[in-house]
């Protein structure tokens, strides 16, 4: 009982991971004008993995997207592309873990083949996590020197007369998401991973068998040093983590100078 | 298409109130903030601030922060300016504009301060 | 606050002629979020309110005649009429809608000589 509420604990755990982590990649803000040196900006930047917002005064959103592959940063590339593969991996680790689930029986799978799938996508969920993770991190990373780097030369001059702000970037909500997301993913491959070792068999039972030695009738039971044989109550200590966030995404999208009705 | 239609000319004495509706129609009202200005006879244009109807968000002029009130009425699409303790240099056409640069204006309300 | 100051104060020019209308800007008005300038160019003529002509200093809002551009960048910008029309005689306005308090030039009285 205790193995399938770890699994499917796992299983719901990653779920709402996975889908922080599709949520985070495709959310348009993961930086976001700093506006501490210009607290009263009309025009508020915003930058995702994908695309460039601005809202300007009127309450109007205009995003851009970025349509070159080439001219992007590397990093932002790398970035891409470990939240993908995170995606893929969750996405593949819950088709597998779906038909591992112990509550579900499909035709003759057997107790072995069960605790392997369900090894396979906690494996899968906790590469799914860490990518999520590592691509969050190496972006805010890229954040954080960028806003030093513009912070050493911030005021540019402009013909000696007038200063201008360079606008800088701080965190976004899609890092926090992603943060969390990407731990939620980990922490449900890891109760995963607990909860195949609870569904894998643990000894071979043999049946019984007499060895006559000559002169005495004593009965051998070999394998007899395992307390529990898989088939009585489980009495080992396992734990379940529990891993519950909420994270939520509040962006309002705009509609253009001719979605007037 | 977009029309944005504003309350009838008001008189008020000195330390009086004034509240301006502005009923928008023929878009999204909560997509779009809407902006308060106002002209003084034969005088240029000054920004009041603007409202938010979509979250009630606001930002006012300093000049204007202690007497202006601005509010919303999703319902009815109409958003409202109040100008408290009135003086006589309060005496303008006040504008409600919204849409991309300001696009769609009010035809103005005229409001004399006068003893 | 960004003040914004317009020249001249009024302008004569002949039908057919091109005016120009100067906007200078206390602190520059570009946005480099996406390379865009954020001023706004109104066209008011008495009893009305004012019209729109040009957003982000270059851009003209639609229905306005192409006679009407708008240039400039940073903290220097200039409305041009081309070729002035007898019913381009009105006040035009240039707007800070990079910071708040969004803030108007004076205003420039255009008519014709």
């Known amino acids: 009982m205790a193995v399938t509420a770890c699994q499917g604990l796992g299983f719901v755990v990653s779920l709402i991971g996975i889908a922080g982590i599709i949520a985070a990649t495709c959310m348009d803000q993961w930086s976001t004008q700093d506006l501490y040196n210009n607290p009263v900006t009309a025009v508020f930047n915003y930058q995702g993995l994908w695309r460039s917002c601005v809202r300007e005064s009127s309450g109007f959103t205009e995003c851009r997207g970025y349509f070159t592959l080439l001219g992007l940063p590397a990093m932002l590339q790398a970035v891409r592309a470990l939240m993908i593969v995170g995606i893929v991996l969750g996405a593949i680790g819950l088709l597998v873990s779906i038909f591992a689930l112990k509550c579900i029986r499909i035709g003759s799978m057997e107790d072995s083949a069960k605790a392997n799938m369900t090894l396979t996508s906690g494996i899968m969920f906790i590469v799914s996590g860490l990518c999520a993770i590592a691509g969050v991190s190496v972006f805010a990373n890229m954040l954080v020197t960028n806003f030093w780097m513009s912070t050493a030369n911030m005021y540019t001059g402009m013909g000696g007369m007038v200063q201008t702000v360079q606008t800088r970037y701080t965190f976004g909500a899609a890092l926090f998401v992603g943060w969390v997301a990407g731990g939620l993913t980990l922490i449900g491959g890891v109760m995963m991973c607990i909860a195949c070792r609870g569904l894998a068999p643990e000894e071979t039972n043999y049946k019984a068998v007499s060895y006559h030695a000559s002169g005495h009738s004593v009965a051998y039971k070999p394998g007899g040093f395992k307390a529990s044989t898989g088939f009585g109550s489980n009495t080992k200590n396992k734990k379940i983590y529990d891993g519950g966030a909420r994270t939520e995404d509040e962006v309002q999208s705009y509609p253009s100078k001719h979605d007037y009705v | 298409q977009v029309q944005l239609v504003q309350s009838g000319a008001e008189v008020k004495k000195p330390g009086a109130s004034v509240k301006v509706s502005c009923k928008a129609s023929g878009f999204t009202f909560t997509s779009y903030n809407i902006h308060w200005v106002k002209q003084a006879p034969g005088q240029g244009l000054e920004w009041i601030g603007y409202?938010?109807?979509?979250?009630?968000?606001?930002n006012y002029n300093l000049k204007f922060k202690d007497r202006a009130t601005m509010t919303s009425d999703t319902s009815i699409s109409t958003a409202y300016m109040e100008l408290s303790r009135l003086r006589s240099d309060d005496t303008a056409v006040y504008f409600c504009?919204?849409?991309?640069?300001?696009?769609?204006w009010g035809q103005g309300t005229l409001v004399t301060v006068s003893s | 606050d960004i003040v914004m100051t317009q020249s001249p104060d009024s302008l004569a020019v002949s039908l057919g002629e091109r005016a120009t209308i100067n906007c200078k800007s206390s602190?520059?008005?570009?946005?480099?979020?996406?390379?865009?300038?954020?001023l706004i160019w109104y066209q008011q003529k008495p009893g009305q309110p004012p019209k729109l002509l040009i957003y982000?200093?270059?851009t003209r809002d639609s229905g306005v005649p192409d006679r009407f551009s708008g240039s400039g960048s940073g903290t220097d910008f200039t409305l041009t009429i081309s070729s002035l029309q007898a019913e381009d005689v009105a006040v035009y306005y240039c707007?800070?809608?990079?910071?708040?308090?969004?803030?108007f030039g004076g205003g420039t009285k255009l008519e014709i000589k």
């Open positions: 982000r200093a270059s």
């Open positions: 602190q520059s008005l570009f946005n480099s979020g996406n390379q865009k300038n954020y």
């Open positions: 504009a919204t849409g991309r640069g300001f696009a769609y």
């Open positions: 409202i938010s109807p979509g979250n009630g968000g606001s």
């Open positions: 707007q800070n809608d990079y910071s708040y308090p969004l803030t």
